[in-house]
């Protein structure tokens, strides 16, 4: 089931997923002046079997002015700068398969990709928050949000994070220990579709993953 809404917005914070659950869709959006190739995929889809998940379909953009030039998915350095992302991706890291079963890693950029990625998350997806540069994190609990299904409707849990305007930056899970307090998380948010094991694995992934693409907008 796709999540009906975006993850919550936290003032002066951005979020990212460490891995994407099967069923997640990423729209093939092109930057201004470019369009999807004729009969090109509308989106990439995280799919697979129990042992391997990968992104099906490939996004390709071509110049709106030319008719037959197809752009390959290999990004050029000058185009990377135009994306509103913090690029930290290691070339050694496999981009199609996450180490967590049933999940995909961040898809690699494609040439002339739009500045913002439109993701369609599925129930059980977890995203992690960090304060933007120049803001410091005050934790009341874990700085993550999970898309949950309750009474037939989807909703995101509220991340326990406040970003204050001090010149310090916070880190992602595993890079600092959040100061969780028992009263930090409301009672209604203690039951979670993502199992403890999922959370532990994802947190371990977050700690060990040196790299990831951090995107400013998900829809």
């Amino acid at each position: 089931e796709l999540c009906d809404d975006d993850p919550p917005e936290i003032p002066h914070a951005t979020f990212k997923a460490m891995a994407y659950k099967e069923g997640t869709m990423l729209n093939c959006e092109c930057k201004r002046g470019f369009r999807r190739i004729k009969s090109g995929s509308l989106y990439m889809l995280c799919t697979g079997n129990s042992s391997h998940s990968s992104w099906d379909n490939q996004c390709q953009c071509t110049s709106s002015a030319t008719r037959n030039t197809t752009k390959q998915v290999t990004p050029q350095p000058e185009e990377q700068k135009e994306r509103k992302t913090t690029e930290m991706q290691s070339p050694m890291q496999p981009v199609d398969q996450a180490s967590l079963p049933g999940h995909c890693r961040e898809p690699p950029p494609w040439e002339n990709e739009a500045t913002e990625r439109i993701y369609h998350f599925v129930v059980g997806q977890m995203v992690y928050y960090q304060c933007v540069q120049g803001y410091r994190a005050l934790h009341r609990g874990p700085a993550e949000s999970v898309c949950k299904m309750t009474h037939g409707k989807t909703r995101w849990t509220q991340p326990q994070l406040i970003c204050t305007g001090e010149m310090e930056t916070s880190q992602f899970p595993g890079e600092e220990k959040p100061q969780a307090s028992p009263e930090g998380r409301p009672e209604s948010e203690t039951s979670c579709l993502v199992t403890t094991t999922d959370f532990q694995i994802q947190t371990e992934m977050a700690a060990t993953m040196e790299t990831s693409i951090f995107t400013t907008e998900y829809q």
Epitope: L2, D4, D5, G23, M25, N27, E29, S39, S41, L42, Y43, L45, T47, D56, N57, I118, H120, Q219
Partner: antibody
Framework: QVQLVQSGAEVKKPGASVKVSCKAS????????MHWVRQPPGQRLEWMGA????????SYSQKFEGRVTITADTSASTAYMELSSLRSEDTAVYYC??????????WGQGTTVTVSS | EIVLTQSPDFQSVTPKEKVTITCRAS?????MQWYQQKPDQSPKRLIY???KSASGVPSRFSGSGSGTDYTLTINSLEAEDAATYYC???????FGQGTKLEIK
């Protein structure tokens, strides 16, 4: 529950245009691609195009490009497919369908368009 | 543009029989979808990602294949399975020409 309700049957003359509507309910309309697929009598299903109502991004089959326009009114949760310069070969049942990613999971009931002089 | 060719076009079968419908793609694809369409009805999803059953689909329906050749199998056919079956490729949104199943 998810429902896609299409407008009623149309009879058009060659050269005219037709606009078919698809009213969506029971889900977040702006977050799913909506496709239009047609089926001429006794023939295969044929993809015409799609729209992502969240940002009005569209994609059209090369066969229909230039003749088909797909739009969406997010305030009314309704998608539209307009086909111009109609000819007799455009006589078909026209379906809207929601894209779940893996497959088209919900379909409208179909709208019969007859092109006849 | 990818072309999907189904065989047979038409098959007349008796209840409880096993039915196999094949779909050949003009170029190698990673996954195939299958839809069922009964007379005067909208299509209904059956199989996705080649071999996964959509929710609510009876277990007698199964899919297999890879590369360019894919198969939809109906084990122990029932009268209600009389319909036209279409293979579908989601990256190009191409459909096969359909296989009509008639129950004897």
């Amino acid at each position: 529950q998810v429902q896609l309700v299409q407008s009623g049957a149309e009879v058009k003359k060659p050269g005219a245009s037709v606009k078919v509507s698809c009213k969506a309910s029971g889900y977040s309309f702006t977050r799913y691609w909506m496709h239009w697929v047609r089926q001429p009598p006794g023939q295969r299903l044929e993809w015409m195009g799609a729209i992502y109502p969240g940002n009005s991004d569209t994609s059209y089959s090369q066969k229909f490009e230039g003749r088909v326009t797909i739009t969406a009114d997010t305030s009314a949760s309704t998608a539209y497919m307009e086909l111009s310069s109609l000819r007799s070969e455009d006589t078909a049942v026209y379906y809207c369908s929601r894209d779940y990613g893996y497959y088209f999971d919900f379909w409208g009931q179909g709208t019969t368009v007859t092109v006849s002089s | 543009e990818i072309v999907l060719t189904q065989s047979p076009d038409f098959q007349s079968v008796t209840p409880k029989e096993k039915v196999t419908i094949t779909c050949r793609a003009s170029s190698s694809r990673s996954y195939m979808q299958w839809y069922q369409q009964k007379p005067d009805q909208s299509p209904k999803r059956l199989i996705y990602d080649t071999s996964k059953s959509a929710s609510g689909v009876p277990s007698r329906f199964s899919g297999s294949g890879s590369g360019t050749d894919y198969t939809l199998t109906i084990n122990s056919l029932e009268a209600e399975d009389a319909a036209t079956y279409y293979c579908h490729q989601r990256s190009s949104y191409t459909f096969g020409q359909g296989t009509k199943l008639e129950i004897k």
